[in-house]
Interface confidence: low
């Protein structure tokens, strides 16, 4: 006996109780492929979900999340509460990002600021709860004769790399020594 069910198009199901006739999917159900023995129940977008695409006889409904929530999982299987930028969602609700971390989205977790020193660079713009730090040029780029399109790094701010600290300390020491010897020399001239 030929299987007539293979002739049943999407939007119908093969009803064996009716000599394998193609019956239309009942209300609120669908079949997305031909030859199906049953229709699938349409997804209902209720509560925190809202309908993005209505169910048709050949395709399931598609859901989105209502305002203030965002989709998680395949085909928006869950809705998670939005937070503000600079926050992350915890079990106790939205919490501000800790110092040294940021979140520039309404979803997800706070991430650590970029460690500019790992790339041998300096911090050009400090990080905030909402924004990552902006890395500037490396100390080597600041040496005389080095050409760089990047503007020079500002003075020391929290989060500066050890290279910069060492460079500034060395410069300060040399300047102090020079001043010290200049003063001594001046005194010697006075004594004569």
């Amino acid at each position: 006996l030929q299987d007539l069910c293979s002739n049943c198009p999407a939007g119908t199901f093969c009803d064996n109780n009716r000599s394998q006739i193609c019956s239309p999917c009942p209300p609120n159900s669908f079949s997305s492929a031909g030859g199906q023995r049953t229709c699938d129940i349409c997804r209902q977008c209720k509560g925190v979900f809202k309908t993005r695409k209505e169910c048709s006889s050949t395709s399931n409904a598609e859901c989105d999340c209502i305002s203030g929530y965002h989709c998680l999982g395949a085909e928006c299987s869950m809705c998670e509460q939005d937070c503000k930028q600079g926050q992350e969602l915890t079990k106790k609700g939205c919490k501000d990002c800790c110092f040294g971390t940021f979140n520039d989205q309404k979803r997800g977790i706070c991430r650590p600021w970029t460690n500019c020193s790992l790339d041998g660079k300096s911090v050009l713009v400090n990080g905030t709860k909402e924004r990552d730090v902006v890395c500037g040029p490396s100390p080597a780029d600041l040496s005389p004769g080095a050409s760089s399109a990047t503007p020079p790094a500002p003075a020391r701010e929290p989060g500066h790399s050890p290279q910069i600290i060492f460079f500034l300390a060395l410069t300060s020491t040399v300047v102090l020594f020079l001043l010290f010897f200049l003063v001594l020399d001046y005194k010697d001239d006075d004594d004569k």
Epitope: P9, G11, I21, P24, C25, P27, S56, S57, T58
Partner: antibody, heavy 117, light 107 residues
């Protein structure tokens, strides 16, 4: 705005073929089915067939041998072809949109076809 | 094929009347029944789908009921614009079939 519009030859000679086009707007043929229905003068409605979003078809068994429904999704057009017309095929031919639970929620205004020599 | 019979081919009623139009199927159709209104100019509109669900934009004076083989359309408070022919249609089994229609006139 959802609309369906039938366009046909008006007059067809007996034993000749009939071709009618249903042009739709405001929705996609990849989402909705289209059915053809006809109404002879002074008589009731007769379902001819349906073309599903995926392109599959079902026909009225009494007319299946001389009926063909096809479509062009990109042009938003559905085509009805009927062979070997006789005088009793004289009717107003409608296309109608088949919504998800198999009701015809939007109908065209219909096109009158007269089979006469 | 499933035969759909509308036993009353025409009926006359007054404005404000409650009118019931019946439709009978030659075998059980599991509530897979729709009702349509055809105006004298040939315009066809859906009124009721799946036996009793009111289509959007249709006045609430229209209602549908029934089960098994016997179904009906009721207009609770007849208005002059309800002058039309009413058709039932089954979609339980191919080929889908319409009733012969009931022409409603105003007295």
């Amino acid at each position: 705005q959802v609309q369906l519009k039938e366009s046909g030859p008006g007059l067809v000679a007996p034993s000749q073929s009939l071709s009618i086009t249903c042009t739709v707007s405001g929705f996609s043929l990849t989402t909705y089915a289209i059915s053809w229905v006809r109404q002879p003068p002074g008589k009731g409605l007769e379902w001819l067939g349906i073309i599903w979003p995926g392109g599959g078809t079902n026909y009225n068994s009494a007319l299946k041998s001389r009926l063909s429904i096809s479509k062009d999704n990109s042009r938003s057009q559905v085509f009805l072809k009927m062979n070997s017309l006789q005088t009793d095929d004289t009717a107003r031919y409608y296309c109608a949109r088949g919504a998800g639970t198999w009701y015809f929620d939007v109908w065209g205004a219909g096109t009158t076809v007269t089979v006469s020599s | 094929d499933i035969q759909m019979t509308q036993s009353t081919s025409s009926l006359s009623a007054s404005v404000g009347d409650r009118v019931t139009i019946s439709c009978s199927a030659s075998q059980g159709i599991s509530n897979y029944l729709n009702w349509y209104q055809q105006k004298p100019d040939g315009t066809v509109k859906l009124l009721i789908y799946y036996t009793s669900s009111l289509h959007s934009g249709v006045p609430s004076r229209f209602s549908g009921s029934g089960s098994g083989t016997d179904y009906s359309l009721t207009i609770s408070n007849l208005e002059p614009e309800d002058i039309a022919t009413y058709y039932c249609q089954q979609y339980s089994k191919f080929p889908w079939t319409f009733g012969g229609g009931t022409k409603l006139e105003i007295k």
